[in-house]
């Protein structure tokens, strides 16, 4: 280990001025002693104030008690100021101060770069008592120094609630260059310039940088750290690293791959997650992104019917979350679906096409020409309609749903009837006399119930009340309320 004392043995004042970080002091006497001396005279004579005439010929009574020993200065003794050593070597340094015995329980603490060193540090304080003063030596040792041990170390001691601070001891740990910034992997556009940065520090300084591309040195002359390498452009992938050299040797950075951006590969595994009559939910696995993040994707949808005009619907979506619901499709139809995604360079090819089908839909139109009339003799209401025009994609008709609402004197009741698919007539029992009956009809497929027809109203005159229970079931004694003619 190299130990370097950068301070010369020079005279210093008997009572040196304030230490950095200590409480300010003043009125420094002008007497000085060699730095190597131990105890100082306390006040062998009365130093005069600058600019003040010395008081002469004053009859001062004789001092009866003479101090047995002069007091040491209330300051840490000067010590080595700068220690240079190699990594993993051991080091020991100390602070020493002599304190009058009246100041018992004084403790010395070690601080590094403004923070107190607590716990697992090898700090030992030894006390050497004399008649009137105790010499205190605080030692600090590091068995195997690391770069993190670099810094400014000081001792602090508290006397009368004042902090006495030592001169700093600078520890400089030297070793191989240490990277503070290494080149980063990059994805670049073909034939476009880019920069790589490499920075390494000692000590010892200076640190010089060489750049390496695909195992060959780029610069013949080293550059002082930090170094920026400007690469004019690449046409193919390359690996770069940097070498950092100082007097202790060489450190090589990690090798970083510089990739050339390209169009993405097509998505794979396009699959159907869910189908309804008018929508299909698809997912896909993105292909390789071509070293450039995906921006968005395009879903292409073609009708698979050979008789269709072959037009393609295009739906654009974000690249994430690799999921899209295609809407506004026809029911009971077959479609071919493909996905393509893009990055900053361009669009991928389309994925392999997949076939998908929508399910049956509910009818899209209501039954037509709904008519309602009263059959007074049988006390029934007859209903007639025309079958709605069936589109193939709506699905197979399975029947009709009839809604009839009876309104009289503030009472309103809705009943629903189901009718098979073959008829176009129905008969319902009169529920209330002196009331209005409102009828609506909807076609039904396996895909669901279609829209109801416009309401048709008929007035049932007052022939007397028909008794019915307040429910959707027919009144006792009555026949099934729906009759298909």
């Amino acid at each position: 280990a190299i130990t370097e004392a950068r301070e010369e043995a020079k005279p210093y004042p008997l009572f040196p001025g304030p230490f950095p970080g200590s409480l300010q002091t003043d009125h420094t006497p002008l007497l000085s002693l060699p730095h190597a001396s131990g105890y100082q005279p306390a006040l062998m004579f009365s130093p005069t104030q600058p600019g003040r005439p010395h008081t002469g010929n004053v009859a001062i009574p004789q001092v009866t008690s003479v101090e047995s020993k002069p007091l040491p200065p209330l300051a840490f003794k000067h010590t080595v100021g700068h220690i240079i050593l190699s990594e993993h070597k051991g080091v020991k340094f100390n602070c020493s101060i002599s304190v009058p015995n009246i100041y018992q329980d004084t403790t010395i603490s070690w601080w590094k770069d403004g923070k107190e060193l607590l716990g697992a540090h090898h700090a030992i304080t030894q006390f050497y008592p004399d008649d009137e003063v105790t010499a205190i030596i605080a030692s600090f040792s590091i068995t195997s120094v690391q770069r993190s041990d670099n810094g400014s170390y000081i001792c602090k001691m508290k006397i009368n609630n004042e902090e006495i601070v030592s001169d700093p001891i600078y520890i400089e740990v030297q070793g191989l260059p240490h990277f503070t910034k290494q080149p980063e992997s990059m994805n670049v556009t073909r034939n476009t310039a880019f920069n790589l940065t490499c920075q390494a520090v000692g000590p010892p300084e200076p640190v010089n940088i060489f750049w390496v591309q695909n195992s060959s040195r780029v610069n013949e002359q080293p550059e002082k750290s930090p170094s920026v390498l400007t690469v004019p452009g690449l046409t193919e992938m390359a690996v770069f690293s940097c070498e950092a050299h100082n007097d202790k040797g060489l450190t090589v950075s990690k090798g970083v791959q510089i990739n050339i951006k390209a169009i993405p590969s097509p998505p794979t595994e396009v699959s159907i997650r869910n189908s309804t009559a008018h929508s299909i939910l698809i997912s896909w696995v993105p292909g390789f992104d071509g070293y450039s993040p995906f921006r968005n994707c395009s879903i292409q949808v073609k009708e698979a019917d050979p008789l269709s005009n072959g037009s393609v619907m295009i739906f654009n979506t974000s690249a994430l979350p690799h999921l899209y619901q295609i809407k506004q499709l026809q029911a009971l139809a077959n479609y071919s679906i493909g996905v393509s995604c893009m990055n900053e360079i361009g669009w991928s090819a389309v994925s392999p096409w997949i076939l998908a089908s929508t399910t049956e839909g509910a009818p899209s139109v209501a039954p037509l020409n709904v008519t309602v009339f009263l059959n007074e003799s049988s006390d029934n209401v007859d209903i007639r309609w025309m079958k709605p025009p069936t589109k193939q994609q709506d699905g197979e008709l399975v029947g009709y749903r009839i809604s009839h609402v009876w309104q009289s004197a503030g009472i309103s009741k809705e009943l629903l009837e189901e009718v098979g698919q073959n008829g176009s007539r129905a008969r319902i029992s009169v529920q209330v006399h002196n009331a209005t009956c409102t009828v609506r009809i909807a076609a039904v497929t396996r895909g669901g119930v279609g829209p109801f027809s416009d309401p048709v109203k008929i007035f049932i005159p007052a022939h007397g009340w028909v008794d019915y229970a307040p429910s959707s079931t027919p009144a006792p004694g009555n026949a099934d309320p729906v009759l298909i003619i």
Partner: antibody, heavy 123, light 107 residues
Framework: EVQLQQSGPELVKPGASVKIFCKAS????????MDWVKQSHGKSLEWIGD????????IYNQKFKGKATLTVDKSSSTAYMELRSLTSEDTAVYYC????????????????WGTGTTVTVSS | DIQMTQSPASLSVSVGETVTITCRAS??????LAWYQQKQGKSPQLLVY???NLADGVPSRFSGSGSGTQFYLKINGLQSEDFGSYYC?????????FGGGTKLEIK
């Protein structure tokens, strides 16, 4: 000009507490310890304790432990002393004083004194 | 605790005279002693620090001497503004005590 301006006179009842202050100006407040001194009427001076404005560390005269509490507010360069469980014995003038040290010696002194705060304890 | 004994307790002198006030410590306090002057109704003022050093602005007719256990404050040629009370104070150890004071009055 270095000055220590103290709070005005206080009349307090026995058993109560009082908090007096000492506002420093004309120097860097954290560079010197602040001490407090008691002077009963017609009597000598008694050192109460001191506070280090940097870290709030305090030292008390054994006699005033539990009686006085010293604090500082660095932002306003003000030192405070709270006196509790007051009795007629606590009737006095209380001074704050800036403490300095002579070079690197063990020789301290009070170079600037506050204006004094009179505390009267009476029912 | 270190005791500080100041003498005399009071002193009646004429303007122009020279006086010496004594302060005795119960144990060796080296030169850790200060002298203060206090006028009626006013705050104390520093005269001498570290036993022998005159504070800024203090007239040269004042002087301090002594070390160890025996200390002196001497005033040569008393002026009318010098009348008041004088206190010594030690700063040795961790509790600082004042002397009982000396009251200087005009004869």
């Amino acid at each position: 000009e270095v000055q220590l301006q103290q709070s005005g006179p206080e009349l307090v009842k026995p058993g109560a507490s009082v908090k007096i202050f000492c506002k420093a100006s004309g120097y860097t407040f954290t560079a010197y310890n602040m001490d407090w001194v008691k002077q009963s009427h017609g009597k000598s001076l008694e050192w109460i304790g001191d506070i280090n404005p940097n870290n709030g560390g305090t030292i008390y005269n054994q006699k005033f432990k539990g009686k006085a509490t010293l604090t500082v507010d660095k932002s306003s360069s003000t030192a405070y002393m709270e006196l509790r469980s007051l009795t007629s014995e606590d009737t006095a003038v209380y001074y704050c004083a800036r403490r300095r040290r002579y070079g690197n010696t063990y020789y301290w002194y009070f170079d600037v004194w506050g204006t004094g705060t009179t505390v009267t304890v009476s029912s | 605790d270190i005791q500080m004994t100041q003498s005399p307790a009071s002193l009646s002198v004429s303007v122009g005279e020279t006086v010496t006030i004594t302060c005795r410590a119960s144990e060796n306090i080296y030169s850790s002693l200060a002298w203060y002057q206090q006028k009626q109704g006013k705050s104390p003022q520093l005269l001498v620090y570290a036993a022998t050093n005159l504070a800024d602005g203090v007239p040269s007719r004042f002087s301090g001497s002594g070390s160890g256990t025996q200390f002196y404050l001497k005033i040569n040629g008393l002026q009318s503004e010098d009348f008041g009370s004088y206190y010594c104070q030690h700063f040795w150890g961790t509790s600082y005590t004042f002397g009982g004071g000396t009251k200087l009055e005009i004869k």
